[in-house]
Interface confidence: low
């Protein structure tokens, strides 16, 4: 004869209040004959849950049909799980007697548990932009969760960051729990593009962790390169000279040419290009009037990034006697196809002021 | 700031229907759920029932069911209490609570409360 | 249902003192206590949570202890603002049930 196993599989079961529980309990052998019965705890106190027999058990139903002659599944469903449905379930096989039935054999125990999922995780990064090479602080933060074991991790582009502090409130216990991690995140050039990740894993999520994201575009800010270049030929009376920005984000930009370190005010033709790493470059091009008595012109482009300090660069004008003396109709080549080009630019400047103008 | 906010005091007769709110502000209101409490004057405090504002679904305290109807309107963050055929022993204050922490979870303790309707059942 | 009993109804007590209130519950319901102070014509305030968790800005001299079946809150310097009713709650198993209450007077 096949000794009778009691088999509760799960150790421990997780529920949220107001939903319904199945606790599983199969039987190895249908011997001796007897009842299985379902109770809460263990000793004399021990509380009744289900007996098919007798009793009125309203809010529990079997899995199978117990009636069946061959059934060897007594798992059972509670509904409308509350607070004080938690304690240790097991299913106990009795042998039938006369005039009792005596108890002869019980699984291992199911402990039930409440469980709460926690939050979807909200990221928040710093107040302030920061340029490359310095630490920003992300927060992650999850809240209403149970039991207190929970797992985060913090991801930089998928790789996992180590960097980071995290405590889960309140320490002692309590129906549900909070958890705040603090990752700090270097900042790299190239970061516009990059996101921060948390995630969160706890055991009701059952193996699909929750995740919050923040874009390090939010946080970084890459200060631009400026280089000023005169172009080497005149158009008629006019030099072209070219200022150019390079590598910075946000887009928030203010450009102004200064002649001899008077502000000009006239429409300068610019473009605005975006690089694969998300920063920007931003082109302006100004022309200059040149005369035998215009011989010391400073000029001067001043760019203010995104509210920062002004940042400018100058440059003397070279006004060879050869470019005095060149004139707007000479020999059609390069200085024919650089007024073509100007052209384009004056003509196509109006449509990127909006981009000049924007704070 | 989260607030609790509740309908004004209620004088009926015996026999009468009574219908407090409860207005919710400052959270997401079908994130946690609601319990009523009550307090006859110069008493302790009952708790009535819970409430899943998610789900609607309530949990009542076996004194308060069957004149006792509680329900939402989660389009407008607020919960009610309904009190059919009023006695003399339900002149009392009532007060909303709410859970502590996110649904899912069970209720508890209470942190937020409304600052309580008088109502007073007289012939 | 499980009772918390309260069994000191009042307390007399004087400014500066060490006061202890006490409650027991009927059955064992771990730490799942609450406590709770109301003043005349207003709502209970939570003061303390799961026995012994201080709620955020409540004065360090209110205490909670205590599990299973008997749990104490106390005042350790007492003062003239502390003077009102005072609740356990457990939330152990429904239906949730609160302390009739201990109310602090001045000697």
């Known amino acids: 004869e096949e000794e009778l196993q009691m088999i509760q599989p799960e150790k421990l079961l997780l529920v949220t209040v107001g939903k319904t529980a199945t606790l599983h309990c199969t039987v190895t052998s249908l011997l001796p004959v007897g009842p299985v019965l379902w109770f809460r705890g263990v000793g004399p106190g021990r509380e009744l849950i289900y007996n098919q027999k007798e009793g009125h058990f309203p809010r529990v139903t079997t899995v199978s049909d117990l009636t069946k002659r061959n059934n060897m599944d007594f798992s059972i469903r509670i509904s409308s799980i509350t607070p004080a449905d938690v304690g240790t379930y097991y299913c106990v096989k009795f042998r039938k007697g006369s005039p009792e039935n005596v108890e002869f054999k019980s699984g291992p125990g199911t402990e039930m548990a409440l469980g709460a999922k926690p939050s979807a995780p909200v990221v928040l990064g710093p107040a302030a932009r920061t340029t490359p090479e310095h630490t920003v602080s992300f927060t992650c933060e999850s809240h209403g969760f149970s039991p207190r074991d929970i797992t985060l991790k913090w991801f930089k582009n998928g790789n996992e960051l180590s960097d980071f502090q995290t405590n889960v409130d309140p320490t002692g216990q309590s129906v549900a729990y909070s958890i705040r991690s603090t990752a700090r995140v270097v900042l790299d050039p190239w970061d516009v593009r990059s996101q921060v990740i948390c995630e969160v894993a706890h055991v009701t999520l059952q193996g699909d962790p929750l995740r919050g994201t923040a874009n390090l575009s939010e946080a970084i800010r890459v200060p631009p390169t400026l280089e000023v270049t005169q172009q080497p030929m005149r158009v008629g009376n006019q030099v072209n000279v070219t200022c150019q920005v390079r590598k910075f984000y946000p887009q928030s930009l203010q450009l102004t040419w200064s002649e001899n370190g008077n502000v000009c005010q006239r429409e300068t033709a610019s473009t605005l290009t975006e690089n694969k790493d998300g920063t920007y470059n931003w082109t302006s091009w100004f022309l200059v009037n040149i005369s035998d008595q215009r011989d010391d012109v400073v000029l001067t482009c001043q760019v203010k990034h995104d509210g920062q300090l002004a940042v400018s660069k100058r440059l003397a004008l070279e006004v060879t006697v050869h470019q005095k003396d060149q004139s707007s109709d000479a020999t059609p080549g390069p200085a024919s196809s650089l007024t073509a080009l100007l052209l384009i630019a004056v003509l196509l400047g109006p449509i990127y002021v909006p981009w000049k103008q924007k704070t | 700031q989260i607030q609790l906010v509740q309908s004004g005091p209620e004088l009926k007769k015996p026999g009468e229907t009574v219908k407090i709110s409860c207005k919710a502000s400052?959270?997401?209101?079908?994130?946690?759920?609601m319990s009523w409490v009550k307090q006859a004057p110069g008493k302790g405090l009952k708790w009535m029932v819970w409430i899943n504002t998610y789900s609607g679904v309530p949990t009542y305290a076996d004194d308060f069911k069957g004149r006792f109807a509680f329900s939402l309107e989660t389009s407008a963050s607020t919960s009610y209490l309904q009190i059919n055929n009023l006695k003399n022993e339900d002149t009392a204050t009532y007060f909303c609570a709410r859970d502590p922490h996110y649904y899912g979870s069970s209720p508890a303790w209470f942190v937020y409360w409304g600052q309580g309707t008088l109502v007073t059942v007289s012939a | 249902d499980i009772v918390m009993t309260q069994s000191q109804k009042f307390m007399s007590t004087t400014i500066g003192d060490r006061v202890s209130i006490t409650c027991e519950a009927s059955?064992?319901?771990?730490?799942?206590v609450a406590w709770y102070q109301q003043k005349p014509g207003q709502s209970p305030k939570l003061l303390i949570y799961?026995?012994?968790n201080r709620y955020t800005g409540v004065p360090d001299r209110f205490t909670g202890s205590g599990s299973g079946t008997d749990f104490t809150l106390t005042i350790s310097n007492m003062q003239s603002e502390d003077l009102a009713n005072y609740f356990c709650q457990q939330y152990s198993a429904y239906p949730f049930t609160f302390g009739s209450g201990t109310k602090l007077e001045v000697k």
């Open positions: 799961s026995a012994s």
């Open positions: 059955q064992i319901v771990g730490i799942a």
């Open positions: 400052g959270y997401t209101f079908t994130t946690y759920g």
